[in-house]
Protein backbone atom coordinates (compact mmCIF):
# COMPACT_ATOMS: atom_id res chain seq x y z
CA UNK A 1 0.00 0.00 0.00
CA UNK A 2 1.84 3.61 -0.80
CA UNK A 3 2.49 5.40 2.08
CA UNK A 4 1.78 9.00 2.68
CA UNK A 5 5.60 9.71 1.90
CA UNK A 6 5.38 8.28 -1.79
CA UNK A 7 2.17 9.52 -2.98
CA UNK A 8 3.85 13.07 -1.50
CA UNK A 9 6.87 11.84 -4.11
CA UNK A 10 4.81 10.88 -6.33
CA UNK A 11 2.46 13.77 -6.79
CA UNK A 12 6.18 16.48 -6.99
CA UNK A 13 6.91 14.42 -9.53
CA UNK A 14 3.58 14.71 -11.89
CA UNK A 15 3.93 18.28 -11.10
CA UNK A 16 7.09 18.33 -12.27
CA UNK A 17 6.11 16.68 -15.16
CA UNK A 18 3.06 19.11 -15.94
CA UNK A 19 4.98 21.55 -15.34
CA UNK A 20 7.80 20.56 -17.89
CA UNK A 21 5.11 19.70 -20.49
CA UNK A 22 3.13 22.61 -20.13
CA UNK A 23 6.53 24.63 -20.97
CA UNK A 24 6.92 22.95 -23.72
CA UNK A 25 2.91 23.81 -24.77
CA UNK A 26 3.94 27.43 -23.97
CA UNK A 27 6.96 27.14 -26.32
CA UNK A 28 5.62 26.13 -29.49
CA UNK A 29 2.04 28.48 -29.01
CA UNK A 30 4.38 31.29 -28.77
CA UNK A 31 3.22 33.38 -31.00
CA UNK A 32 6.74 34.43 -31.83
CA UNK A 33 7.00 30.75 -33.12
CA UNK A 34 7.72 31.08 -36.65
CA UNK A 35 7.64 26.71 -36.46
CA UNK A 36 4.11 26.56 -35.56
CA UNK A 37 2.68 25.25 -39.06
CA UNK A 38 5.75 23.53 -39.70
CA UNK A 39 5.35 21.30 -36.35
CA UNK A 40 1.77 20.50 -36.41
CA UNK A 41 2.21 18.30 -39.69
CA UNK A 42 3.69 15.68 -37.10
CA UNK A 43 1.56 13.01 -36.00
CA UNK A 44 1.78 11.58 -32.81
CA UNK A 45 0.39 8.19 -31.48
CA UNK A 46 -2.10 8.89 -28.13
CA UNK A 47 -3.31 6.08 -25.83
CA UNK A 48 -6.54 4.41 -26.29
CA UNK A 49 -6.60 4.56 -22.42
CA UNK A 50 -4.72 6.52 -19.76
CA UNK A 51 -5.76 6.76 -16.34
CA UNK A 52 -2.81 4.97 -14.39
CA UNK A 53 0.60 5.34 -13.94
CA UNK A 54 1.37 2.25 -15.64
CA UNK A 55 0.27 4.07 -19.15
CA UNK A 56 2.82 6.67 -19.03
CA UNK A 57 4.10 3.76 -21.00
CA UNK A 58 2.99 5.20 -23.97
CA UNK A 59 4.26 8.78 -23.21
CA UNK A 60 7.75 7.51 -22.95
CA UNK A 61 7.56 5.92 -25.98
CA UNK A 62 6.66 9.08 -27.88
CA UNK A 63 9.87 10.96 -26.22
CA UNK A 64 12.33 10.28 -29.48
CA UNK A 65 9.82 11.67 -32.05
CA UNK A 66 8.69 14.41 -29.96
CA UNK A 67 12.51 15.39 -29.44
CA UNK A 68 12.90 15.12 -33.20
CA UNK A 69 9.94 17.71 -33.91
CA UNK A 70 10.92 19.70 -30.71
CA UNK A 71 14.80 20.09 -32.75
CA UNK A 72 12.99 22.23 -35.10
CA UNK A 73 11.77 25.03 -32.90
CA UNK A 74 14.09 28.24 -32.15
CA UNK A 75 16.45 27.02 -29.49
CA UNK A 76 15.53 30.64 -27.95
CA UNK A 77 11.47 29.32 -27.43
CA UNK A 78 12.98 26.93 -24.70
CA UNK A 79 15.12 27.09 -21.45
CA UNK A 80 16.54 23.98 -21.86
CA UNK A 81 17.84 21.82 -25.63
CA UNK A 82 15.19 19.59 -26.48
CA UNK A 83 17.88 16.91 -25.76
CA UNK A 84 17.98 17.90 -22.39
CA UNK A 85 14.47 18.36 -21.65
CA UNK A 86 13.03 15.52 -22.61
CA UNK A 87 15.96 13.06 -21.26
CA UNK A 88 14.37 15.00 -17.88
CA UNK A 89 10.96 14.42 -18.72
CA UNK A 90 12.13 10.66 -19.60
CA UNK A 91 13.93 9.99 -15.97
CA UNK A 92 10.58 11.24 -13.92
CA UNK A 93 8.46 9.36 -16.81
CA UNK A 94 10.70 5.89 -15.52
CA UNK A 95 10.26 6.78 -11.50
CA UNK A 96 6.47 7.21 -12.34
CA UNK A 97 5.42 3.92 -14.03
CA UNK A 98 8.08 2.20 -12.34
CA UNK A 99 10.75 -0.31 -14.31
CA UNK A 100 9.38 -3.84 -12.96
CA UNK A 101 6.34 -3.31 -14.53
CA UNK A 102 6.12 -4.37 -18.55
CA UNK A 103 2.58 -2.57 -20.16
CA UNK A 104 2.49 -2.75 -23.65
CA UNK A 105 0.78 0.20 -24.73
CA UNK A 106 -2.64 0.38 -26.82
CA UNK A 107 -2.90 3.35 -29.18
CA UNK A 108 -5.76 4.65 -30.26
CA UNK A 109 -6.22 4.81 -34.13
CA UNK A 110 -6.34 8.72 -34.96
CA UNK A 111 -3.08 10.64 -34.69
CA UNK A 112 -2.80 13.72 -32.83
CA UNK A 113 -0.67 17.50 -33.68
CA UNK A 114 2.04 17.95 -30.91
CA UNK A 115 -0.15 20.31 -29.16
CA UNK A 116 -3.27 18.00 -28.94
CA UNK A 117 -0.76 15.11 -27.94
CA UNK A 118 1.27 17.56 -24.83
CA UNK A 119 -2.67 18.60 -24.02
CA UNK A 120 -3.22 15.44 -23.67
CA UNK A 121 -0.17 14.52 -21.63
CA UNK A 122 -1.35 17.77 -19.69
CA UNK A 123 -5.03 16.67 -18.75
CA UNK A 124 -3.57 12.94 -17.50
CA UNK A 125 -1.09 14.31 -15.50
CA UNK A 126 -3.93 16.92 -13.75
CA UNK A 127 -6.48 14.19 -13.35
CA UNK A 128 -4.03 11.69 -11.66
CA UNK A 129 -2.58 14.77 -9.00
CA UNK A 130 -6.09 15.99 -8.58
CA UNK A 131 -6.75 12.05 -7.08
CA UNK A 132 -3.59 12.11 -4.81
CA UNK A 133 -4.45 15.40 -2.74
CA UNK B 1 9.99 18.04 -60.94
CA UNK B 2 11.74 18.45 -57.49
CA UNK B 3 15.45 19.40 -59.00
CA UNK B 4 18.39 20.42 -56.26
CA UNK B 5 21.11 21.93 -58.28
CA UNK B 6 24.73 22.04 -57.33
CA UNK B 7 27.34 24.39 -57.82
CA UNK B 8 30.81 23.28 -59.90
CA UNK B 9 33.87 21.68 -58.78
CA UNK B 10 36.37 23.78 -56.23
CA UNK B 11 40.30 23.39 -55.56
CA UNK B 12 41.50 25.20 -52.57
CA UNK B 13 44.22 25.57 -50.37
CA UNK B 14 44.82 24.41 -47.10
CA UNK B 15 43.56 27.22 -44.61
CA UNK B 16 41.32 29.04 -46.85
CA UNK B 17 36.86 28.57 -47.13
CA UNK B 18 34.71 27.85 -49.86
CA UNK B 19 30.81 28.80 -50.18
CA UNK B 20 28.78 25.56 -52.30
CA UNK B 21 25.46 26.67 -53.67
CA UNK B 22 22.10 24.32 -54.05
CA UNK B 23 19.35 25.88 -56.22
CA UNK B 24 15.90 24.09 -55.77
CA UNK B 25 13.84 24.18 -58.30
CA UNK B 26 9.80 22.40 -58.69
CA UNK B 27 9.17 23.61 -55.26
CA UNK B 28 9.41 25.95 -52.85
CA UNK B 29 12.35 25.97 -50.63
CA UNK B 30 10.99 27.16 -47.77
CA UNK B 31 8.51 24.08 -48.06
CA UNK B 32 10.99 21.65 -46.82
CA UNK B 33 14.74 21.09 -44.83
CA UNK B 34 17.93 21.36 -46.93
CA UNK B 35 19.89 19.04 -45.79
CA UNK B 36 24.23 18.70 -46.30
CA UNK B 37 25.66 15.63 -46.74
CA UNK B 38 29.72 14.92 -47.24
CA UNK B 39 30.83 11.87 -49.02
CA UNK B 40 34.73 10.50 -48.76
CA UNK B 41 34.98 6.86 -50.44
CA UNK B 42 36.79 5.81 -47.60
CA UNK B 43 34.48 7.37 -44.93
CA UNK B 44 31.35 6.90 -46.69
CA UNK B 45 28.41 9.05 -46.10
CA UNK B 46 28.02 11.38 -42.71
CA UNK B 47 25.10 14.17 -42.31
CA UNK B 48 26.14 17.43 -41.92
CA UNK B 49 23.34 19.38 -40.64
CA UNK B 50 20.07 21.52 -41.81
CA UNK B 51 18.42 24.06 -42.55
CA UNK B 52 15.25 25.63 -42.51
CA UNK B 53 14.90 28.16 -45.08
CA UNK B 54 12.15 29.98 -43.80
CA UNK B 55 13.55 30.91 -40.88
CA UNK B 56 17.39 30.47 -41.48
CA UNK B 57 17.26 28.01 -38.29
CA UNK B 58 19.95 25.45 -38.33
CA UNK B 59 21.22 22.56 -36.75
CA UNK B 60 25.10 20.48 -37.62
CA UNK B 61 26.20 17.30 -36.50
CA UNK B 62 28.90 18.31 -33.35
CA UNK B 63 32.07 17.37 -35.60
CA UNK B 64 30.83 20.37 -37.97
CA UNK B 65 29.41 22.44 -35.71
CA UNK B 66 32.70 24.72 -36.58
CA UNK B 67 33.52 23.66 -40.18
CA UNK B 68 30.17 24.68 -41.85
CA UNK B 69 27.81 27.26 -41.70
CA UNK B 70 24.51 27.08 -43.43
CA UNK B 71 22.69 29.91 -45.40
CA UNK B 72 19.59 30.25 -47.68
CA UNK B 73 18.31 32.80 -49.59
CA UNK B 74 14.73 32.53 -50.59
CA UNK B 75 14.75 34.98 -53.03
CA UNK B 76 16.91 32.81 -55.36
CA UNK B 77 15.53 29.68 -53.62
CA UNK B 78 18.98 28.62 -52.90
CA UNK B 79 20.45 27.37 -49.93
CA UNK B 80 24.28 27.21 -49.22
CA UNK B 81 27.40 25.75 -46.93
CA UNK B 82 30.88 27.45 -46.44
CA UNK B 83 33.34 25.55 -44.84
CA UNK B 84 35.85 27.05 -43.14
CA UNK B 85 39.75 26.30 -42.02
CA UNK B 86 40.23 23.81 -44.83
CA UNK B 87 42.24 20.74 -44.42
CA UNK B 88 43.01 17.96 -46.86
CA UNK B 89 40.41 15.78 -44.90
CA UNK B 90 37.79 18.24 -46.42
CA UNK B 91 38.50 16.84 -49.91
CA UNK B 92 35.04 15.14 -50.34
CA UNK B 93 32.00 15.66 -52.21
CA UNK B 94 29.06 17.30 -50.62
CA UNK B 95 25.41 16.66 -51.20
CA UNK B 96 22.52 18.98 -50.48
CA UNK B 97 19.22 16.93 -50.39
CA UNK B 98 15.61 17.10 -48.90
CA UNK B 99 12.77 14.80 -47.70
CA UNK B 100 10.50 12.87 -49.04
CA UNK B 101 8.04 15.87 -48.46
CA UNK B 102 7.19 18.59 -45.96
CA UNK B 103 5.62 16.19 -43.39
CA UNK B 104 8.51 14.41 -42.79
CA UNK B 105 12.31 15.63 -41.88
CA UNK B 106 14.34 12.49 -43.09
CA UNK B 107 15.07 10.05 -45.08
CA UNK B 108 16.58 12.21 -47.31
CA UNK B 109 14.67 11.29 -50.86
CA UNK B 110 15.95 14.40 -53.66
CA UNK B 111 20.03 14.73 -53.50
CA UNK B 112 21.98 17.33 -55.52
CA UNK B 113 24.42 15.98 -57.78
CA UNK B 114 26.95 16.86 -55.65
CA UNK B 115 29.92 19.32 -55.87
CA UNK B 116 33.58 17.59 -55.47
CA UNK B 117 36.05 19.84 -53.12
CA UNK B 118 39.26 19.03 -53.25
CA UNK B 119 41.61 20.64 -50.84
CA UNK B 120 45.57 21.13 -51.91
CA UNK B 121 48.60 23.00 -51.50
CA UNK C 1 24.70 8.74 -31.24
CA UNK C 2 22.89 5.77 -32.30
CA UNK C 3 25.70 3.66 -33.92
CA UNK C 4 25.15 1.97 -37.29
CA UNK C 5 26.87 -1.64 -37.90
CA UNK C 6 26.66 -2.30 -41.57
CA UNK C 7 28.11 -5.57 -43.29
CA UNK C 8 29.73 -7.19 -45.25
CA UNK C 9 32.47 -4.23 -45.84
CA UNK C 10 32.33 -5.66 -49.87
CA UNK C 11 30.68 -8.37 -51.62
CA UNK C 12 31.64 -10.04 -54.82
CA UNK C 13 28.61 -11.71 -56.95
CA UNK C 14 27.43 -12.89 -60.18
CA UNK C 15 24.86 -12.03 -61.80
CA UNK C 16 21.42 -13.53 -61.14
CA UNK C 17 22.37 -14.09 -57.69
CA UNK C 18 20.78 -13.46 -54.38
CA UNK C 19 22.57 -10.83 -51.92
CA UNK C 20 21.87 -9.70 -48.23
CA UNK C 21 23.60 -6.84 -46.83
CA UNK C 22 23.28 -6.53 -42.64
CA UNK C 23 22.87 -3.57 -40.53
CA UNK C 24 22.87 -3.52 -36.94
CA UNK C 25 21.71 -0.50 -34.73
CA UNK C 26 23.21 0.33 -31.43
CA UNK C 27 19.32 0.85 -30.01
CA UNK C 28 15.95 0.16 -31.50
CA UNK C 29 14.66 2.23 -34.24
CA UNK C 30 11.15 1.03 -33.70
CA UNK C 31 8.43 3.74 -32.74
CA UNK C 32 5.74 2.10 -31.32
CA UNK C 33 2.94 4.43 -31.85
CA UNK C 34 2.91 3.24 -35.85
CA UNK C 35 4.91 0.47 -35.62
CA UNK C 36 7.32 2.06 -37.86
CA UNK C 37 11.16 1.99 -38.18
CA UNK C 38 13.04 4.06 -39.08
CA UNK C 39 15.52 2.96 -41.45
CA UNK C 40 15.98 3.75 -44.79
CA UNK C 41 18.72 2.17 -47.64
CA UNK C 42 20.42 3.70 -50.71
CA UNK C 43 22.60 2.95 -53.42
CA UNK C 44 25.29 5.07 -54.45
CA UNK C 45 27.12 4.36 -58.22
CA UNK C 46 30.52 5.61 -58.35
CA UNK C 47 30.34 9.68 -59.43
CA UNK C 48 26.82 9.73 -58.69
CA UNK C 49 24.21 11.18 -55.76
CA UNK C 50 22.78 8.40 -53.37
CA UNK C 51 19.50 7.20 -54.49
CA UNK C 52 16.99 6.00 -51.91
CA UNK C 53 15.57 2.75 -52.04
CA UNK C 54 14.20 1.43 -49.02
CA UNK C 55 11.96 3.71 -46.01
CA UNK C 56 10.54 2.73 -43.02
CA UNK C 57 12.87 -0.54 -43.22
CA UNK C 58 10.45 -2.43 -45.76
CA UNK C 59 8.73 0.52 -47.49
CA UNK C 60 10.25 0.50 -51.16
CA UNK C 61 10.60 3.95 -52.85
CA UNK C 62 8.47 4.78 -56.42
CA UNK C 63 10.22 3.31 -59.32
CA UNK C 64 12.80 1.06 -57.31
CA UNK C 65 12.91 -2.36 -58.70
CA UNK C 66 11.16 -4.84 -56.14
CA UNK C 67 13.71 -7.14 -56.73
CA UNK C 68 15.21 -4.56 -53.29
CA UNK C 69 13.68 -5.99 -50.52
CA UNK C 70 14.09 -4.60 -47.15
CA UNK C 71 13.34 -6.64 -43.84
CA UNK C 72 13.90 -6.03 -40.11
CA UNK C 73 12.96 -4.60 -37.01
CA UNK C 74 14.18 -3.08 -33.98
CA UNK C 75 17.83 -3.25 -34.58
CA UNK C 76 18.66 -5.99 -37.00
CA UNK C 77 18.00 -5.23 -40.74
CA UNK C 78 18.76 -6.48 -43.73
CA UNK C 79 18.26 -5.39 -47.65
CA UNK C 80 18.23 -8.03 -49.99
CA UNK C 81 18.94 -7.83 -53.95
CA UNK C 82 17.35 -11.25 -55.31
CA UNK C 83 18.45 -11.84 -59.14
CA UNK C 84 21.44 -9.42 -58.88
CA UNK C 85 21.80 -7.21 -62.21
CA UNK C 86 24.98 -5.71 -63.51
CA UNK C 87 23.16 -2.10 -62.81
CA UNK C 88 23.14 -3.06 -59.23
CA UNK C 89 27.36 -2.97 -58.65
CA UNK C 90 27.35 0.05 -56.04
CA UNK C 91 27.58 0.91 -52.64
CA UNK C 92 24.88 0.44 -50.32
CA UNK C 93 24.44 2.32 -47.41
CA UNK C 94 21.93 1.85 -44.56
CA UNK C 95 20.30 5.17 -42.58
CA UNK C 96 18.99 5.40 -38.89
CA UNK C 97 16.69 8.34 -38.48
CA UNK C 98 14.92 7.69 -35.53
CA UNK C 99 17.22 10.39 -33.85
CA UNK C 100 18.92 13.22 -34.12
CA UNK C 101 21.61 13.06 -35.75
CA UNK C 102 20.75 10.57 -38.66
CA UNK C 103 23.80 8.34 -39.03
CA UNK C 104 24.83 6.06 -41.79
CA UNK C 105 26.21 2.45 -41.88
CA UNK C 106 29.83 2.44 -43.20
CA UNK C 107 28.58 1.30 -46.42
CA UNK C 108 28.89 -1.94 -48.61
CA UNK C 109 30.69 -2.69 -51.86
CA UNK C 110 29.02 -4.59 -54.32
CA UNK C 111 31.53 -6.14 -56.93
CA UNK C 112 31.32 -8.49 -59.66
CA UNK C 113 32.98 -11.64 -59.22
Known amino acids: APTSSSTKKTQLQLEHLLLDLQMILNGINNYKNPKLTRMLTFKFYMPKKATELKHLQCLEEELKPLEEVLNLAQSKNFHLRPRDLISNINVIVLELKGSETTFMCEYADETATIVEFLNRWITFCQSIISTLT | EIQLQQSGPELRRPGSSVKLSCKAS????????IHWVRHRPEHGLEWIGW????????RYAQKFQSKATLTADTSSNAAYMQLSSLTPEDTATYFC??????????????WGQGTLVTVSS | DIVMTQSPFSLAVSEGEMVTINCKSS????????????LAWYQQKPGQSPKLLIY???TGQSGVPDRFIGSGSGTDFTLTISDVQAEDLADYYC?????????FGAGTKLELK
Open chain 2, 97 to 110: ARSLDSTYIYPFAY
Open chain 2, 26 to 33: GYNITDNL
Open chain 2, 51 to 58: IDPEDGET
Open chain 3, 27 to 38: QSLLRSGNQKNY
Open chain 3, 56 to 58: YAS
Open chain 3, 95 to 103: LQHYQSPPT
